[in-house]
């Protein structure tokens, strides 16, 4: 990973594009910290393992988060 100690936040660009929950391998929500003062959302896609930074403020991404958390709550006992 091209990461040096001087890099504070992971996302160079963010995407508003809706993501199909079925095409998601993993969804990471990185809370704001001393290194990066904003929340970052990183989607790992099943296709080629591509990772994509998502815009936490986008309506489509908020809907995705709801859908994913709903799916998780269904699965958890």
């Amino acid at each position: 990973v091209p990461l040096s100690r001087t890099v504070r936040c992971t996302c160079i660009s963010i995407s508003n594009q809706p993501v199909n929950p079925r095409s998601l391998e993993k969804l990471e929500i990185i809370p704001a910290s001393q290194f990066c003062p904003r929340v970052e959302i990183i989607a790992t896609m099943k296709k080629k393992g591509e990772k994509r930074c998502l815009n936490p403020e986008s309506k489509a991404i908020k809907n995705l988060l709801k859908a994913v958390s709903k799916e998780r709550s269904k699965r958890s006992p």
């Epitope: 990973v1 091209p2 990461l3 040096s4 001087t6 890099v7 504070r8 936040c9 992971t10 996302c11 160079i12 660009s13 963010i14 995407s15 508003n16 594009q17 990066c36 003062p37 904003r38 990183i42 080629k48 591509e50 990772k51 994509r52 930074c53 998502l54 815009n55």
Partner: antibody
Framework: QMQLVESGGGVVQPGRSLRLSCTAS????????MHWVRQAPGKGLEWVAV????????FYVDSVKGRFTISRDNSKNTLYLEMNSLRAEDTAIYYC?????????????????WGQGTTVTVSG | EIVLTQSPGTLSLSPGERATLSCRAS???????LAWYQQKPGQAPRLLIY???SRATGIPDRFSGSGSGTDFTLTISRLEPEDFAVYYC??????????FGPGTKVDIK
């Protein structure tokens, strides 16, 4: 459609300063990292600087560190390159380029939109 | 710092022929960080391939990218007249910096 338009180039004497601008349209400028890339006459491409979508990080090629500053004004959809202590070897076409949607330190989507460039000539 | 080398420097081919362009890194590069660009005289570069093998939006399927580690390849399956240009590979490396190769010129035989 997505467009980037550079301005501010010109002929300048060694040691002087110049500020380049790049105005974006057709996409949400505040969502994308931005780059400056240059091309000396008859030569290949050389990356100069990058700025994260929110200005949180800025990085430079070694040859311009301490002389050039990249910045952005998301309210004006504009990217800047402040160039100080200019040298003859800075003579080039300067392009601004958009970092692809969703790019991060774990996956790189390339520079997917480019301006037509502005020419900087440093000559004494 | 990773250095990219492209070969050949110039490739002379005829329309309809297959072009194979090589990009070699001085040390291993993750395929996630490798891109290819096309530049025609007097024009800005255009992104062709990202992630070593994914075509950018609007790029015809005669362009394909492959490779891993230190060796990457751009293939143009059948050259069209508009494909004669200079092609650059580029990698995103630590620090972070974005390094271009010196380019391969594809010209008409």
């Amino acid at each position: 459609q997505m467009q980037l338009v550079e301005s501010g180039g010109g002929v300048v004497q060694p040691g002087r300063s110049l500020r380049l601008s790049c105005t974006a349209s057709g996409f949400t400028f505040s969502n994308n990292g931005m780059h400056w890339v240059r091309q000396a006459p008859g030569k290949g491409l050389e990356w100069v600087a990058v700025i994260w979508f929110d200005g949180m990080n800025k990085f430079y090629v070694d040859s311009v560190k301490g002389r050039f500053t990249i910045s952005r004004d998301n309210s004006k959809n504009t990217l800047y390159l402040e160039m100080n202590s200019l040298r003859a070897e800075d003579t080039a076409i300067y392009y601004c380029a958009r970092e692809g949607d969703g790019s991060g330190i774990y996956y790189y989507y390339g520079m997917d939109v480019w301006g037509q460039g502005t020419t900087v000539t440093v000559s004494g | 710092e990773i250095v990219l080398t492209q070969s050949p420097g110039t490739l002379s081919l005829s329309p309809g022929e297959r072009a194979t362009l090589s990009c070699r890194a001085s040390q291993s590069v993750s395929s996630s960080y490798l891109a290819w660009y096309q530049q025609k005289p007097g024009q800005a570069p255009r992104l062709l391939i990202y992630g070593a093998s994914s075509r950018a939006t609007g790029i015809p399927d005669r362009f394909s990218g492959s490779g891993s580690g230190t060796d990457f390849t751009l293939t143009i399956s059948r050259l069209e007249p508009e494909d004669f240009a200079v092609y650059y590979c580029q990698q995103y490396g630590s620090s972070p910096i974005f390094t271009f190769g010196p380019g391969t010129k594809v010209d008409i035989k």
